[in-house]
Structure formats: structure tokens, C-alpha cells
Interface confidence: low
């Protein structure tokens, strides 16, 4: 049987599992799917962790790919530097380990890039289109400490069955992490049901101690115990639940108290009640009801940007419609001239340049920058009427490439249910489907953001759409999550679905990568909050059409714009933008966009940073890095970060002075 | 067992045309970089070009850009070269090779002559 | 372009002997540089990879070194068979480039 239609499977160590999913899915679906178990896409930064990953990959079918979470923003190649340009989904740059397949080329990297590993032979990187669906993808889970596997005893009728917090079920694992539950079925009849929760003393283990299978007490039936089962001195039995239930009134069964609890977000077991509500970051819970959670308005302050403003975790930018620009005090808005249309005779030569279109996503994958032509460069050339986002815009296309909308897998976690913690501070709980579409809408002209109007017409505070403002009083700025939601009260026709033009601004410290909102229909608006943002987030930026589709009507389609708002590195405050940020610069870290799906030229002015990272040395330019051997592999080596004409192509342990080169602000993603 | 297998080759004349063609079999041809690579007894091996897995992205030595064609079929699981614009400079063995950034499996080689 | 400059040209030595054949670039690739042997009248055949890793088939006696821009590829107990040309080849960059080849011959 292929294994590769088989369950997921996962390798643990004492603080991370990764874990394998053969499921044909384009980066973004996979992304959000590992996001929604509590991870992310896998990152092996370093041999050891390539080890780990090669070992749960084994020898795949050779044309099997699985997605990993890198990924880079059209036109930022950085060929010197071992990612080339590529940003690990958690944000940083950071690396000691690379493996491409193939050398780099010195193209002009017109589209967004994603990275699968091979699932054959070396599990060599390949780069090629994020809209591409491919075979599976892996998942890197991180938590606070990890149980070891259960020893067998004679009692036993079989392993231990552990089901871990993100869903996968097994008998092969060695460490189960934090919130993992062990079944262990005895030959007497009963189990036992163990969970691996944080010891009084510190640490974490098994909320039981063997021997599990005894012959007497407990059994035949687990003394009626729903859980746990416990033998008294006396002789007589009682019944214990596992951490985060309670016993019911029977004595013999638990109950979960945030079942029932009335929670808005997310519960969390204990408390007076039972349980206790928490709101996800970038929510707080409502004065009158501590189970609600409103949204923390910000840039709602009149005046704070002429046209627009797109605010960021720990300040805002001010940003023109099109055919205007920032004036010198980062607010204002003055006419541009003809400036747009130059901007897209410019981009059509770029794209047009060497034959290399933006690329084909039906053709197979491939391993050099810029390698698939997606969509013809040219369709993006078309003329647009100034763009009015109460309008949804879609492009036509031949009946066989009317975009498919790929929706999340449902199975996990279940749609409506909070997470349960540990994980409520990680786990991306999406509580409606989100519909992406990968397909290209009729752009506005290259350089200039669309006109989203920043004075809003008067609306009850239901039917407000928050725009956040730079600070929050009551969180570390590095938590404050970015929304720019604009209301329209006109309809689109009802033919027309309505999108979201989804941009992202650049990040800063929590190393944040995108979340999805949760949508409501108020009328005729459509109120987009996004879920609170957990380290390892990062904001949209949204433009929202004035109705759903009645076909989904708990669906949002998220269709990414092309055009876009550029961020200005810290070392040029004189630029067209506005940054007020209280986050020291030298902690700024630039953060991509992983769920923007690929094809998207990236349409920035040709600005270059000023404060382009240098390449570092090591300290010790003769020492090597441990040779870890792999099996007829690519093994780790020391890679100097010295000007060269391309990076490695090869596997590469680098020096621990590359480490220290955190990802200065020298790429802007939006 | 992996098998490169180059056919096609012989004399033609200066500014005439020809197509090599290498035959692929016992691995996934549609996941692999192909390349031609040639050899001349007075210049040793060189590259010529290499084909993405997918063949529509493509590199060439600057001495044969413009006059040859790397292209493949995935259904057939052939990989070719057409020659155009002929020069003698071209003489040579040429070997199709999978491409793994370092070159795995060869081909036998065919030989093209280019003399008038 | 990276050049790669391989010495000596020729190497004459007796079976059992130990040889070191070099391959220097014009500039560093890293480890992107692989080692062939070339038999006569036969295909090139991938010996090294990645500057010292040995492909499965190959014997032990087969070894290489290096990183940047100098690289060794070391023959231990030279034997008949290992009558060749050695070439070194870089896939650092575009275009990807051999060098001219060390041919070894016994005594």
C-alpha cells in the first residue's frame, strides 16, 4: 500500500514533534492547517532538526513534495545569503542548515516563491509556485516539555495508543508532548487512560504512575470510571478525571467544563466556575460581560492619516490612492501625475524581461528562482477604471481555469470549538471557513495603492468596521495586532462575489505571520475581526466588499492584491511613510506574508534599503560545523557568508556568526 | 536502474540544424533538472544547457545561446536539444545527464560532427 | 564565470600509492564541487559530491576535502582501474563549469 495514502504520521523530541501530512494542499492551505493544529510549517534550521525531518520523511516516493515553511515575496532574491531571500513562516532569516537542490540563478525573481522538500532520496529544497498543490506537507509543533513513551508491561494487551494535542494518533512515538493522552488497554479487560500534564515539582509527565495493569481492583470495567480509576487503601474504588475535566454528579463520569461554558473565544479550565474565559490577543473581554470579547479599536483617532492608514503591531503608516503621494510629513496626500501609468509600462517590461513571464502553475515543479510561469505577465497589463472596493472586481477566465476555491480541511480542529490549553495561546481556532482564491483581480496601476477612503460614513457601532491606532494601553506593543478594515455601504451586484484584497504590512518583534478573520454579516456591512494575534502572527490589512456570496454565506473569499503599500526601512525616515513605532529598530524583523497566495507580482517602487545587511564572517573562518552523516546524503557544511557568486546549492551548516545576523529590516513584505 | 539513453547525432553541415534526443527510464523524469553536457577532445567537458523539471524554465552557456533549444516532454520522458546555426566550435560528444545541481547519471553520448 | 584550474595535468604513479589530485576556483563556491571519472572512451561517472561526500559504489579509497575555492580529491592504493581522467565541476553559479582534468596514468 502507498504510504502516502496513509494516516499523518509525526516524530517527537523532549521539546518539538514534526509531523507529516500527506494531503494535497497549496502552501496557504497547508499553512493555515498546521497553524490551525497549533504549529507551523517546518523550519529546520539546523542539521540535527534536517535529521529528524529526514528520518519521519524516510525514503517517499521520488516525486513526492512536501511543503516546509519558507517562502519569499517577488523580486527580494538575496542569491549571497543562504536563504536567497527566503523567510521562514515564523518570520526571521535565521539559519544553519540549507539544502537546495539546485544552484541559484541570478533572474530577477518575479513571483512569490514557496519551498518543498523532496520526499525522495536527500529531501533536497525545491522552489516553485505557492499556488501549487503538492502531495503533502510537514508540521513543527514546539511545546513546553514532552513524556516519554510508556514502557510495555506483561499486563498489558497491546501498546499504548497516544493521541497528541494536535490530533495524531499513534503507537510509535518516543516523547508524547505536553497534552498527549496515553490509552493503555490491559488483558484483564480494563485500561487506562494517562495524560502527560506538568508535574507539581516542574517538569511534565504522566498523570499516573505504573504499573497500569494490575489484575485485581479496578477491573473488569475500570471501576465505572469514565477516566481514571483509583484504588483506595480501604479497598473500595473512586473515580478520577484527567486534568481540564471535572467529575459529574454520578461520581463516575467527567464532564469538560468549557463545554458548556458560555466563552465567546476561548475557556480554560478552573476557576470558581469551572472554567474561565479568556479573548484571544487583540480582544478584551466586554465591561457588562466578561464572556464576550470586543475588538480593541484603534485607528479610529479623525485625521490621524489624510487618505489612509494601515496600522502595523506597534504603530501605523500612512499610505495615497492612486495618482497621489505622501507628501514630506508622512500625511498628507498630493496629486502624483501620470506617475501610475509609467509605474505599469515599467512592470510590463520587468515581467516581460527575458521571456520570463510570471509563471504556469499547471507545469511541474522545478528548482531555480523564477522557474513556472504562472499567469501570462501580460494579463496584469490590462487598463482598470479607478478602483472602487465596493465593487468586486474579477477577472474572466476560460471555463477550465475558472479558479478553484480551496477551503481548510474541516477535520481538524472541529470548526466551532475553542482550543483547550495548553494551546489556547497558539492555536489559530478558525470558527468559519475562509475561501481563498489564488486567481488574479484587474489591478490598480502599479506603484500606487488602491483608494480606500479614511473618513467612514456614520455607522452605529455595530455596523463599525475597527481600524486599530497605534498603541494599546493594556499589552506589550509586541503583541498589539494591526487591522485596517474600511466599510463601504454600497452593494456590489449580486453577480459578483465580493473579495478581500488582502495586503500585509511588515511586522515587527513577535515574529507574526497572518491570521484569518472571523466574519460576521451586519446588514450591509461585512465586520471582518481578526482572531487575536499570537506570537508568530501577523495582521491583514483588509478591503472588504459590501456582501457575501449567498452560495457561502459563511464563507469570506479572500483574493490577494497585487498592488503594494511599501515599507520603508527604519534607516530611511525621511521616505514617503509614515512610521511611528515605540519598538527599538534594532529588534525589527522582517516578516513574510505566508498566506499570500503566490503569483502576486510584488509592485514596490525600486527602492533600495540603505541599511542593507553586510555579509558577516565567522569569527573562526576555518572552523567547521559538526559533520552529522546521512545516509548516502547531503551532509552539513561550513559555508563562509562572504561575497560569492551565488549561495550554496548544497546543504550547509553555517557558521555561528551567520546566526547572529538577525534579518535586519532589508526586505519589506506587505 | 537509471538509463539516459542519446540518439540523433552525426555529420551536418556549418549553419545546418539538428536535434539530439535522450530517452529517459527508471526514475521520476518530470521531478528532475536534465541537462546537456559535451566534450570536445581539445576543450573537455562543458555545459550546454539545463531544463527545470517542468521545461519551460532554461539555461544556456553564453556560446550557444540564441542557436539551441533544451526542451523535454514528460509524457515521453524525453529530453532534447535543437541545434541551430551549426558551427564547427560545436564538434562534439554529447551527453544528456540528470541534473541534480551535480550531474548523477549520463548518458553513453552521441557523437555530432560539423564540417563541411 | 568561475574558473576552475585542476593540477597537476598529468600524474604518473605506481600501484599502491597515494595521490592527491587539486582543483582550485576563481572563486569560492562554497562546497558546491563535485569529482568525475572519466574512463576512456566511456561516460563520465559522479564520484564526490558536495566537496567530500563519497556516492554509494564508490570505494572507500576515494576521498575529497575542501571548502571555498581549493579542493583535493585523494586516491588511496592507486589501483590499474583507477586509470582515468578527474574532473572537478562547480554548481555554485551559473554557468556551471568543469575543470580542464587531471588524467592519472600507472607506471
Known amino acids: 500500500q502507498d504510504p502516502w495514502a496513509a494516516e499523518p504520521r509525526a516524530a517527537c523530541g523532549p521539546s518539538s514533534c514534526y509531523a507529516l501530512f500527506p494531503r494535497r494542499r497549496t502552501f496557504l492551505e497547508a499553512w493555515r492547517a498546521c497553524r490551525e493544529l497549533g504549529g507551523d510549517l517546518a523550519t529546520p534550521r539546523t542539521p540535527e532538526e534536517a535529521q529528524r525531518v529526514d528520518s519521519l520523511v524516510g525514503a517517499g516516493p521520488a516525486s513526492r513534495l512536501l511543503w516546509i515553511g519558507l517562502q519569499r515575496q517577488a523580486r527580494q532574491c538575496q542569491l549571497q545569503r543562504p536563504l536567497r531571500g527566503f523567510t521562514w513562516t515564523t518570520g526571521d532569516q535565521d539559519t544553519a542548515f540549507t539544502n537546495w537542490a539546485q544552484p541559484a540563478s541570478g533572474g530577477p525573481c518575479p513571483a512569490q516563491r514557496c519551498v518543498a522538500l523532496e520526499a525522495s532520496g536527500e529531501h533536497r529544497w525545491l522552489e516553485g509556485s505557492c499556488t501549487l498543490a503538492v502531495d503533502g506537507y510537514l508540521c513543527q509543533f514546539g511545546f513546553e516539555g514532552a513524556c516519554p513513551a510508556l514502557q510495555d508491561e506483561a499486563g498489558q494487551a497491546g501498546p499504548a495508543v497516544y493521541t497528541t494535542p494536535f490530533h495524531l494518533v499513534s503507537t510509535e512515538f518516543e516523547w508524547l508532548p505536553f497534552g498527549s493522552v496515553a490509552a493503555v488497554q490491559c488483558q484483564a479487560g480494563r485500561g487506562a487512560s494517562l495524560l502527560c500534564v506538568k508535574q507539581p515539582e516542574g517538569g511534565v509527565g504522566w498523570s499516573r504512575a505504573g504499573p497500569l495493569c494490575l489484575g485485581t481492583g479496578c477491573s473488569p470495567d475500570n471501576g465505572g470510571c469514565e477516566h481514571e480509576c483509583v484504588e483506595e487503601v480501604d479497598g473500595h474504588v473512586s473515580c478520577r478525571c484527567t486534568e481540564g475535566f471535572r467529575l459529574a454528579a454520578d461520581g463516575r463520569s467527567c464532564e469538560d467544563p468549557c463545554a458548556q461554558a458560555p466563552c465567546e473565544q476561548q475557556c480554560e479550565p478552573g476557576g470558581p466556575q469551572g472554567y474561565s474565559c479568556h479573548c484571544r490577543l487583540g480582544f478584551r473581554p466586554a465591561e457588562d460581560d466578561p464572556h464576550r470579547c470586543v475588538d480593541t479599536d484603534e485607528c479610529q483617532i479623525a485625521g490621524v492619516c489624510q487618505q489612509m492608514c494601515v496600522n502595523y503591531v506597534g504603530g501605523f503608516e500612512c499610505y495615497c490612492s492612486e495618482g497621489h503621494e505622501l507628501e514630506a510629513d508622512g500625511i498628507s496626500c498630493s496629486p502624483a501625475g501620470a506617475m501610475g501609468a509609467q509605474a505599469s509600462q515599467d512592470l510590463g517590461d520587468e515581467l516581460l524581461d527575458d521571456g520570463e513571464d510570471e509563471e504556469d502553475e499547471d507545469e511541474a515543479w522545478k528548482a531555480f528562482n523564477g522557474g513556472w510561469t504562472e499567469m501570462p505577465g501580460i494579463l496584469w497589463m490590462e487598463p482598470t477604471q479607478p478602483p472602487d472596493f465596493a465593487l468586486a472586481y474579477r477577472p474572466s477566465f476560460p471555463e477550465d481555469r475558472e479558479p478553484q476555491i480551496p477551503y481548510p480541511e474541516p477535520t481538524w480542529p472541529p470548526p466551532l470549538s475553542a482550543p483547550r490549553v495548553p494551546y489556547h495561546s497558539s492555536v489559530l481556532s478558525v470558527t468559519r471557513p475562509v475561501v481563498v482564491s489564488a486567481t488574479h483581480p484587474t489591478l490598480p496601476s502599479a506603484h500606487q495603492p488602491p483608494v480606500i477612503p479614511a473618513t467612514h460614513p456614520a455607522l452605529s457601532r455595530d455596523h463599525q468596521i475597527p481600524v486599530i491606532a497605534a498603541n494599546y494601553p493594556d499589552l506589550p506593543s509586541a503583541y498589539q495586532p494591526g487591522i485596517l478594515s474600511v466599510s463601504h455601504s454600497a452593494q456590489p451586484p449580486a453577480h459578483q462575489p465580493p473579495m478581500i484584497s488582502t495586503k500585509y504590512p511588515e511586522l515587527f518583534p513577535a515574529h507574526q505571520s497572518p491570521m484569518f478573520p472571523d466574519t460576521r454579516v451586519a446588514g450591509t456591512q461585512t465586520t471582518t475581526h481578526l482572531p487575536g494575534i499570537p506570537p508568530n502572527h501577523a495582521p491583514l490589512v483588509t478591503t472588504l466588499g459590501a456582501q457575501l456570496p449567498p452560495q457561502a454565506p459563511d464563507a469570506l473569499v479572500l483574493r490577494t492584491q497585487a498592488t503594494q503599500l511599501p515599507i520603508i526601512p527604519t534607516a530611511q525616515p525621511s521616505l514617503t511613510t509614515t512610521s511611528r513605532s515605540p519598538v527599538s529598530p534594532a529588534h525589527q524583523i522582517s516578516v513574510p506574508a505566508a498566506t499570500q497566495p503566490a503569483a502576486l507580482p510584488t509592485l514596490l517602487p525600486s527602492q533600495s534599503p540603505t541599511n542593507q545587511t553586510s555579509p558577516i564572517s565567522p569569527t573562526h573562518p576555518h572552523s567547521k560545523a559538526p559533520q552529522i552523516p546521512r545516509e548516502d546524503g547531503p551532509s552539513p557544511k561550513l559555508a563562509l557568508w562572504l561575497p560569492s557568486p551565488a549561495p550554496t546549492a548544497a546543504p550547509t551548516a553555517l557558521g555561528e556568526a551567520g546566526l547572529a545576523e538577525h534579518s535586519q529590516r532589508d526586505d519589506r513584505w506587505l | 536502474e537509471v538509463q539516459l539513453v542519446e540518439s540523433g547525432g552525426g555529420l551536418v553541415q556549418p549553419g545546418r540544424s539538428m536535434k539530439l534526443s535522450c530517452a529517459a527510464s527508471g526514475f521520476t523524469f518530470r521531478n528532475y533538472y536534465m541537462a546537456w553536457v559535451r566534450q570536445a577532445p581539445t576543450r573537455g567537458l562543458e555545459w550546454v544547457a539545463s531544463?527545470?523539471?517542468?521545461?519551460?524554465?532554461?539555461y544556456y552557456r553564453d556560446s550557444v545561446k540564441g542557436r539551441f533549444t533544451i526542451s523535454r516532454d514528460t509524457a515521453e520522458n524525453t529530453l532534447y536539444l535543437q541545434m541551430d546555426s551549426l558551427r564547427s566550435e560545436d564538434t562534439a560528444t554529447y551527453y544528456c545527464a540528470r541534473a541534480y545541481g551535480y550531474f548523477d547519471y549520463w548518458g553513453q553520448g552521441v557523437r555530432v560532427t560539423v564540417s563541411s | 564565470d568561475i574558473v576552475l584550474t585542476q593540477s597537476p595535468t598529468t600524474l604518473s604513479v605506481t600501484p599502491g600509492e597515494t595521490v592527491s589530485l587539486s582543483c582550485r576556483a576563481s572563486h569560492s563556491v562554497g562546497t558546491n564541487l563535485h569529482w568525475y571519472q572519466q574512463k576512456t572512451n566511456e561516460s563520465p561517472r559522479l564520484l564526490i559530491k558536495d566537496a567530500s561526500q563519497s556516492m554509494s559504489g564508490i570505494p572507500s579509497r576515494f576521498s575529497a576535502s575542501g571548502s571555498g575555492t581549493d579542493f583535493t580529491l585523494n586516491i588511496k592504493n592507486v589501483e590499474f582501474d583507477d586509470v582515468s581522467s578527474y574532473f572537478c565541476?562547480?554548481?555554485?553559479?551559473?554557468?556551471?563549469?568543469f575543470g580542464s582534468g587531471t588524467k592519472l596514468e600507472i607506471k
Open positions: 565541476q562547480q554548481t555554485q553559479s551559473w554557468p556551471l563549469t
Open positions: 531544463t527545470g523539471s517542468g521545461g519551460d524554465f532554461t
